[in-house]
Every structure is written in structure tokens, then in C-alpha cells.
Interface confidence: low
């Protein structure tokens, strides 16, 4: 019970695995917390010990490595389940120690059930494909290390519940699923089921990911400011509310940061001594093109405010654009008794 460097519960590694399938889980110590790898630790005489805490319990207990058919085993820095059971769900701890050193980290493992159409509470990775962009592929994820290269697995791909066979533009090619040309209709969940033999038993690995067809870089353009534009004049009397929307269209660009901002007289609104509020809304098209609207609002506009320059700016990886709003002070309507009558030469 000597002191141990405890990295706590690593919730960033929310590991989910399917029931009745193999799972191999690497001790996170060597991946995220320590500056040396397992081999170095092992050579230095450190021992890796595994514990677990069952779901809804608070008692850390050793893992039983003497189950029939070695259902749970450890190999170097990997904890193996062949296969998992629903009640394996819990928090797992790996501890590296010798007589003078100790370091440990815990992580949650959730064993989830799936139905015959692969629906489950599993969080799915999203893979984006460019629309009508030519051949693209997705790869069956997280299957490395489950079987040696000498073993030839069988891989079956599904879209939703349906086996991908003779699909027009989607071709299973081993661990890869090739989209000869991607359309919106290809949006959906794709599952690969990898079947392989091991010691006279057959195991299945199920991996599902979500495919989202997005705008192609071929069609990407710099931001387009729809509003303000030259056709709309914001004419206000002092004391009225001034509302100017800045509406910008952004083509989808992978990993691009889309930005919209207002300047007033060349400064950020925060740097101007007036009561300005800016509200933003965002909408997306089916291909994840984005429309951002920022509404600049001055509750009670002054004649001074109506002389200022209001410019909407937008920026993406494709470029930067800006557009000024046309803001004017409304000329008061003439009062008949004085101005209008005089205009008609009345005395």
C-alpha cells in the first residue's frame, strides 16, 4: 500500500466494445502518461498489473486470468478478452510497479449489445466523403493486432442492415470499402464484420462508422456575403432599433474555421462606446455547406451611430471578404401645416 502516482480515471478513453467479440485494450500509461514504452519498463524490471472495478461497485479487484479458454489474458501491455461478456463492463486499472516505483491509471470499459442490424449505444466515428469527387474509401477501423498477417479474415460490409453486394457505386475490397463516386444517398452507417479463426474458434469483429457526404473541394469557393448587399438600405430615425443581418455562405472545407465578424468604424464592436449586441445563428446544408448569420443590433440608435461605417467580414480557408451595410438617417416626413403649405405658396 505504498504511495503510487495515480493518474485517476482517464475518461477521455471511454472504451466501448461489443458483447461476445474479442477486444484488445492497451494500457493507457504508455500512450498518454509516461515517457517510456512497455519494453523499456519491462527491461527495467517493472511489472504491469491489472485490476478492475465492476460496474456499480467501488472495490478494485485483480482480474481473473484463469478463466476457461483463457477468456481474459494479458500480453505485454495489452489486456485481451476472447470474447467479452456483458458483465465485463467496469473501470479497469493498469499499474506499473517495482519496489521503488509505482504508477497507475484507470479507464472505463463498456461492453455494449448490438441488434441484428448493428444498432447499439456505441458512439460512431464519422468519415466524411466528398460529393462526386471520384474514388474514395473507408477502411474497417481498429482491427490491427487481432490476428497475425498469416491469417486471412473474411470481411463483410453492410450499409445499415443490408449486405453490400452488387451496389452500383460501392465496392467492398477487403478491409476497404470503395465509393466509386459518392452521392448524398451514400450517407448512413456502414459496418464491417471481420471474421477470423483462432485456436479452433471463430471470432467476429464488428466495426460501424457513419459516412457523411460533404461538399467537394472542387466546388469550394471563398465566403459569399448575401447580406448586407447593395439592394438594401438601412434607413432609421434616431431612437429606433437598428438591426443589420450579416448572412454568409461558406462552402464545406475539411478542417476549415469559418469566421464572421462585424466592424464599426473599423473597430470591433466591443471597442466602440455604444450598446451593440450581436446574435449568431448557423445552419447547414445536406453537404455541410454552412450559412452563418450575425445580426448586429443597436436598441436605440443615435444620429451619430447612423453616420458610422458598419462592415461585415467573413473568412474561411478559401479567403476573406467584407461588405459594408448602407446605413442612413431617415429624412423626417414634412409636416403639412408648415413645410407643405409653404411649398404650395399658401399665405
Amino acid at each position: 500500500s505504498e504511495r503510487c502516482d495515480d493518474w485517476g480515471l482517464d475518461t477521455m478513453r471511454q472504451i466501448q466494445v461489443f458483447e461476445d467479440e474479442p477486444a484488445r485494450i492497451k494500457c493507457p500509461l504508455f500512450e498518454h502518461f509516461l515517457k517510456f514504452n512497455y519494453s523499456t519498463a519491462h527491461s527495467a524490471g517493472l511489472t504491469l498489473i491489472w485490476y478492475w472495478t465492476r460496474q456499480d461497485r467501488d472495490l478494485e479487484e485483480p482480474i481473473n486470468f484463469r478463466l476457461p479458454e483463457n477468456r481474459i489474458s494479458k500480453e505485454k501491455d495489452v489486456l485481451w478478452f476472447r470474447p467479452t461478456l456483458l458483465n465485463d463492463t467496469g473501470n479497469y486499472t493498469c499499474m506499473l510497479r517495482n519496489t521503488t516505483y509505482c504508477s497507475k491509471v484507470a479507464f472505463p470499459l463498456e461492453v455494449v449489445q448490438k441488434d441484428s442490424c448493428f444498432n447499439s449505444p456505441m458512439k460512431l466515428p464519422v468519415h466524411k466523403l466528398y460529393i462526386e469527387y471520384g474514388i474514395q474509401r473507408i477502411t474497417c477501423p481498429n482491427v490491427d493486432g487481432y490476428f497475425p498477417s498469416s491469417v486471412k479474415p473474411t470481411i463483410t460490409w453492410y450499409m445499415g442492415c443490408y449486405k453490400i453486394q452488387n451496389f452500383n457505386n460501392v465496392i467492398p475490397e477487403g478491409m476497404n470499402l470503395s465509393f466509386l463516386i459518392a452521392f448524398i444517398s451514400n450517407n448512413g452507417n456502414y459496418t464491417c464484420v471481420v471474421t477470423y479463426p483462432e485456436n479452433g474458434r471463430t471470432f467476429h469483429l464488428t466495426r460501424t462508422l457513419t459516412v457523411k457526404v460533404v461538399g467537394s473541394p472542387k466546388n469550394a469557393v471563398p465566403p459569399v456575403i448575401h447580406s448586407p448587399n447593395d439592394h438594401v438600405v438601412y434607413e432609421k430615425e434616431p431612437g429606433e432599433e437598428l438591426l443589420i443581418p450579416c448572412t454568409v455562405y461558406f462552402s464545406f472545407l475539411m478542417d476549415s474555421r469559418n469566421e464572421v465578424w462585424w466592424t464599426i468604424d473599423g473597430k470591433k464592436p466591443d471597442d466602440i462606446p455604444i450598446d451593440v449586441t450581436i446574435n449568431e445563428s448557423i445552419s447547414h446544408s445536406r453537404t455541410e455547406d454552412e450559412t452563418r448569420t450575425q445580426i448586429l443590433s443597436i436598441k436605440k440608435v443615435t444620429s451619430e451611430d447612423l453616420k458610422r461605417s458598419y462592415v461585415c467580414h467573413a473568412r474561411s480557408a478559401k479567403g476573406e471578404v467584407a461588405k459594408a451595410a448602407t446605413v442612413k438617417q431617415k429624412v423626417p416626413a414634412p409636416r403639412y401645416t408648415v413645410e407643405l403649405a409653404c411649398g404650395f405658396g399658401a399665405t
Epitope: 498469416s150 486471412k152 479474415p153 465496392i171 475490397e173 477487403g174 476497404n176 466509386l180
Partner: antibody, heavy 121, light 107 residues
């Protein structure tokens, strides 16, 4: 027994058009791609393109795009390769091959016997 | 497109010897590589698919190995009927491409 039987040898003049055929039998013709491969005299194999007879979806190698047209008539289990205007450089042996895109691999598992096209003035 | 480079261009061996043919891809193609044998005046014949799987009816003296970018076709104890040209072909992405071929000739 899976078989791909190609049409006979052709001798043509430059500028003429040509359509050669590849008839599949012994398997579900609409369930497999048919690829076309060129082999110029004394040279290696070049992939030209591929067609999915079920809906005639085609893919061409960039080198052959616009130079040839691949088509299929699923009612008679036949794929075609055609030229609108032949050139002397089109002289070659042309093979059709079935592309077996199974669950975990893709290959050209059955080949036609080849059609020799000679273009000479 | 993916370029496949085969080496050597020609391999001169005697019957009974072992032939080792190499195929290198310009980028990783996983295991999506096939090997074909072609004899003069004949259509190519599939020998190995998915880098290492033996096509039905092909003698077991033929074997394939490799993954990623480097692949090998090995013919143990060459028989007289094995003297031919061998092509590798990738099915990883369109356009499908072939290597330029390795001719195995009698020494």
C-alpha cells in the same frame, strides 16, 4: 463453367470504327464487373476500364477516357469495347476479364481468349 | 494512379530452382495485390489474390507474400510449364494498374 468468349480477330484501316464483344456464360453476368485490358505487341498489360453490366456503370482509366467506349447488353450477357476512329497505335490484343469483387478481395479471375485488332493502311 | 514496379525484368533460372519475383507499389495498397501468369499467345491466368491467397487449381509451389508496398511471388522448384511472364496488379483503387511484368526464362 465460367467462360468469357470474345469475338474474332479484326483487321481495320485507320479512321474506321470497330466494336468487339465479350460474352459471359456459366455465372450471373450482371453480378460481376467486366474489365478490358490492352496488350500491345511485345508489351505488358494495361487496364482500360470496367463496366458493371447490371446498370452499365463504367469506369475508365485516364489513359483511355474518351478514346474508347465500354458498354454492355445484359439481355445477352455481352460486354463491348468500341472505337469510333481507329489509329495504327490501337493495334493490340484486347482481353476482357471478369472482376471478382468478393467480400475481401478483388481480382480478374476469368479471362477471355483475347481479340487481336490490327489497324493498318 | 498507383504505379507498380516489378523486378527483375527478366529472371534466368533452371528447372528445379526457386524464383523470387518482386513487386513494389508507389503507395500502400494494403493486401490488395494479385499475381497473374501469362504464356505467349495466351490470356493471363490468376495465380495469387489478396497478396497471399492461392487461386483454386494453382499448384502449391506458387506462393505470395507482402503487404503495404512490397510484395513477393515465390515459385518453389520451377517446372518447365512455369517459364512465362508474371504480372502483379493492384485492386486497391481505380484505375487498376499492372506492373510491367517479369519474364522467367530457362537458363
Amino acid at each position: 463453367e465460367v467462360q468469357l468468349v470474345q469475338s474474332g480477330a479484326e483487321v481495320k484501316k485507320p479512321g474506321e470504327s470497330l466494336k468487339i464483344s465479350c460474352k459471359g456464360s456459366g455465372y450471373s453476368f450482371t453480378s460481376y464487373w467486366i474489365g478490358w485490358v490492352r496488350q500491345m505487341p511485345g508489351k505488358g498489360l494495361e487496364w482500360m476500364g470496367i463496366i458493371y453490366p447490371s446498370d452499365s456503370y463504367t469506369r475508365y482509366s485516364p489513359s483511355f477516357q474518351g478514346q474508347v467506349t465500354i458498354s454492355a447488353d445484359k439481355s445477352i450477357s455481352t460486354a463491348y469495347l468500341q472505337w469510333s476512329s481507329l489509329k495504327a497505335s490501337d493495334t493490340a490484343m484486347y482481353y476482357c476479364a471478369r472482376r471478382n469483387s468478393a467480400e475481401n478481395y478483388a481480382d480478374l479471375d476469368y479471362w477471355g481468349q483475347g481479340t487481336l485488332v490490327t489497324v493498318s493502311s | 494512379e498507383i504505379v507498380l514496379t516489378q523486378s527483375p525484368g527478366t529472371l534466368s533460372l533452371s528447372p528445379g530452382e526457386r524464383a523470387t519475383l518482386s513487386c513494389r507499389a508507389s503507395q500502400s495498397i494494403s493486401n490488395d495485390l494479385n499475381w497473374y501468369q501469362q504464356k505467349p499467345g495466351k490470356a493471363p491466368k490468376l495465380l495469387i489474390y489478396y497478396a497471399s491467397s492461392l487461386q483454386s487449381g494453382v499448384p502449391s509451389r506458387f506462393s505470395g507474400s507482402g503487404s503495404g508496398t512490397d510484395f513477393t511471388l515465390t515459385i518453389n522448384s520451377l517446372q518447365p510449364e512455369d517459364f512465362a511472364t508474371y504480372y502483379c496488379q493492384q485492386s486497391f483503387t481505380a484505375p487498376l494498374t499492372f506492373g510491367q511484368g517479369t519474364k522467367v526464362e530457362i537458363k
